[in-house]
């Protein structure tokens, strides 16, 4: 969703979306200077009127947070940036049509890895998004993507891995050796929209077996 550059003042106007946080970004072209200022407008697909984004008028930074303005994940949106440099005409560039549902990327999950003597427990914490339900609750990724599941891997050594997959939030790798270091990785996947997060990685060591001390 990047526009083609036909000017030296403004280029690469695009949405960058992660976990439904939708940031409009752009680059100044070779003709832009330190006094170039930018103004942002946005609209819902199908509407004619452009709306000015408060807080993103005549700014010098090259990004603008449009999360609240584009928070309906079932809708399509456009945004445009107008660049003005001293003594020159304004240049406007528009994004491609943007859908947060289609275009957002998924961040690694938040996971707690808990070592035990012969097992490692992994607790996945729900990922909150800025998307709101009708009653004003922030929705989790699990409440938006029916097909979302977690892929867990435990690297036992260079040649052997254990795998678990599921829609649960609690997992346990069993039958491990005490007092041994393991590398865990947990990824979020949503098959229908072909999304896959980078993995959350934890390095944990199983607890030493103290039972011999009591025998």
């Amino acid at each position: 969703h990047t526009t083609v550059d036909t000017s030296g003042l403004l280029q690469h106007v695009k949405f960058q979306s992660s976990n439904f946080e939708n940031i409009l970004t752009w680059d100044g072209g070779p003709a832009s200077t330190s006094d170039t200022v930018y103004s942002v407008e946005y609209k819902k697909y199908g509407e004619r009127k452009w709306l000015a984004k408060a807080g993103c008028q005549r700014i010098t930074q090259k990004f603008c947070n449009l999360t609240m303005e584009t928070r309906n994940h079932t809708e399509f949106y456009y945004a445009k940036v107008t660049a003005v440099s001293a003594g020159g005409p304004p240049v406007t560039k528009m994004t491609d049509r943007f859908s947060s549902l289609q275009h957002t990327t998924i961040k690694p999950p938040d996971v707690t890895c808990i070592p035990k003597v012969r097992s490692i427990q992994m607790l996945v914490h729900p990922t909150l998004t800025p998307v709101l339900s009708e009653d004003g609750h922030q929705l989790t990724l699990e409440e938006i993507f029916h097909d979302l599941f977690y892929r867990l891997e435990l690297h036992v050594n260079h040649t052997y891995q254990m795998h678990l997959e599921g829609k649960q939030r609690e997992y346990e790798f069993l039958g491990l050796t005490p007092d041994t270091e393991f590398l865990g990785s947990i990824t979020i996947l949503t098959p229908i929209l072909s999304k896959e997060s980078a993995p959350y990685v934890c390095r944990v060591k199983t607890l030493p077996d103290r039972t011999w001390a009591y025998s």
Epitope: V131, H146, D147, L164, R169
Partner: antibody, heavy 117, light 107 residues
């Protein structure tokens, strides 16, 4: 204890309508995925529709799109299936089910829907 | 839609027999497969999830395994209470789809 109790089934003529209900208790209804699953006489199981009770996101199997509507009343912990333009092939036992802790492990006892003239 | 091809459609077993039921997915579904048992007039009952994990309270004679897109349910020693119809379910993407079912009867 999780409980799901369906009601609203019955005999209806082709082209007619029915509204199924599923009263839920024993879990957090207002933040769950709820399903309607059906089983035609002597046949296998088929997922019909799903709704997330918080986000309101819905999905339907192709054969019922435009005819069936899934909805909830979160204040009353109730799931609904509005079935319009019913066909003989919609004759089945309709179960509601829910996903708890990632697993579709709780089902109602089912309600019979018969579409016949 | 993902098709789940289940075989056999029925089988006859003697008590104590080892029984194997197979499901083949039409595409990759990772390990997102569950097995259910259904008795006449009852709702399905979850046995196995994640292709191989035993649901709490299910007897250990039930086990599941995966090889690529092929999944197997094994009953290591059939008991009278196991006579029922068994379904696999892919929980990978909507619409969730069941296999056609396998009816386990007494020989």
């Amino acid at each position: 204890e999780v409980q799901l109790v369906e009601s609203g089934g019955g005999l209806v003529q082709p082209g007619g309508s029915l509204r199924l209900s599923c009263a839920a208790s024993g879990f957090t209804f207002s933040s769950s995925w709820m399903y309607w699953v059906r089983q035609a006489p002597g046949k296998g199981l088929e997922f019909v529709s799903v709704i997330n009770t918080r986000s309101g996101i819905t999905h339907y199997v192709e054969s019922v799109k435009g005819r069936f509507t899934i909805s909830t009343d979160n204040a009353k912990n109730t799931l609904f299936l509005q079935m319009n333009s019913l066909k003989s092939e919609d004759t089945a036992v309709y179960y509601c089910a829910t996903r708890i802790q990632g697993l579709i492990d709780y089902w109602g006892q089912g309600t019979q829907v018969t579409v016949s003239s | 839609d993902i098709q789940m091809t289940q075989s056999p459609s029925s089988l006859s077993a003697s008590l104590g027999d080892r029984v194997t039921i197979t499901c083949q997915a039409s595409q990759s579904i990772s390990s997102m497969l569950a097995w259910y048992q259904q008795k006449p007039g009852q709702a399905p009952n979850l046995l196995i999830y994640g292709a191989s994990r035993l649901q709490t309270g299910v007897p250990s004679r039930f086990s599941g395994s995966r090889s690529g897109t092929s999944f197997t349910l094994t009953i290591s020693g059939v008991e009278a209470e196991d006579l029922a119809t068994y379904y696999c379910l892919q929980d990978y993407s909507w619409p969730l789809t069941f296999g056609q079912g396998t009816k386990v009867e007494l020989k």
